[in-house]
């Protein structure tokens, strides 16, 4: 039927748009692990990356996040 | 609700070491946020990201502008703050404070500053 | 040549659909994320991991990412919708984040 057809489209739709993200976190990674080696870009004491430095960060503050469920940003209104 | 002010001075000398300030209201800036950060706006450059603070001091600096550049934090006031020394014109811009947020890569600006013109001239 | 390159400049009718474009090698691995700047304001996050949108932006404003590509799409476009706006993400290496040069949407 039209309404089976839309419901699998809309599934199809919603699996495709999560593989898309798992790809990009999954080659993002990997690209992590080259950005490493080359160490290049920004610059500091400690962290062999920019990436590496943002992990470090986000994965210590998690503790925080994970106090509050609510994780979507708030921003001014744009209208 | 967390709000950022810069302060500095709107005016520097060339060759002088500009100083600018973030007060953040509404909240800690070791609890609320991952990291805060400071970014320049100039017309013939567009925006670029300076230097990064994390919620635990820990910093990164921009490559073009890591030898002058300081950024520090004094959690008792709840300010971070930026220093650009040996300053010439092209330094002219607003800068802006920043609350960054994000568990992807890369992180995004979830607040800013209102922003504060400073320009470099004799 | 900028990492993001974005239209410099983009004209929508009243009510219709404006889409700014956003494009860099490195969006196929690391997220965007849209600002909108008005006249002797500061940006204004609207979208943000391609494609959420924060509490209190209008769901006009959404993003999108396909490939080398990112895209936001602000669909029933309003007058108050004018204003630049930027795209950023990270280089090709990953180790920098970068904004796009900005599009200038005017709403006719």
């Known amino acids: 039927s039209e309404a089976e057809d839309a419901s699998l489209l809309s599934f199809m739709q919603g699996y495709m748009k999560h593989a898309t993200k798992t790809a990009k976190d999954a080659l993002s990674s990997v690209q992590e692990s080259q950005v490493a080696q080359q160490a290049r870009g920004w610059v500091t004491d400690g962290f062999s990356s920019l990436k590496d430095y943002w992990s470090t960060v986000k994965d210590k503050f998690s503790e925080f996040w994970d106090l509050d469920p609510e994780v979507r940003p708030t921003s001014a209104v744009a209208a | 609700q967390v709000q950022l002010q810069e302060s500095g001075p709107g005016l520097v000398k060339p060759s002088q070491t500009l100083s600018l300030t973030c007060t953040v209201s509404g909240g800690s800036i070791s609890t609320t946020a991952p990291a805060w950060g400071w970014i320049r706006q100039s017309p013939g450059k567009g925006l670029d990201w300076m230097a990064v603070?994390?919620?635990?001091?820990?910093?990164y600096y921009s490559p073009s502008l890591k030898s002058r550049t300081l950024i520090s934090r004094d959690t008792s006031k709840n300010q971070f703050s930026l220093q650009l020394s040996s300053v010439t014109p092209e330094d002219t811009a607003v800068y802006y404070c920043a609350r960054l947020g994000g568990r992807n890569y890369p992180p995004y600006v979830e607040l800013w500053g209102q922003g504060t013109l400073v320009t470099v001239s004799s | 040549q900028p990492v993001l390159t974005q239209p410099p400049a983009l004209s929508v009718t009243l009510g219709q659909t404006a889409k700014i474009t956003c494009q860099g090698g490195s969006l196929r691995v690391s997220y965007a994320h849209w600002y909108q700047q008005k006249p002797g304001q500061a940006p204004v996050l609207v979208s943000y991991?391609?494609?959420s949108r924060p509490s209190g932006i209008p769901e006009r404003f959404s993003g999108s990412g396909s490939g080398a590509t990112a895209t936001l799409t602000i669909s029933g476009a309003q007058a108050e919708d004018e204003g630049d706006y930027y795209c950023?993400?990270?280089?090709?290496?990953?180790?920098?984040?970068?904004f796009g040069g900005g599009t200038h949407l005017t709403v006719l």
């Open positions: 991991d391609d494609d």
């Open positions: 603070i994390a919620f635990d001091g820990s910093a």
């Open positions: 950023q993400s990270a280089d090709s290496s990953g180790d920098n984040w970068v």
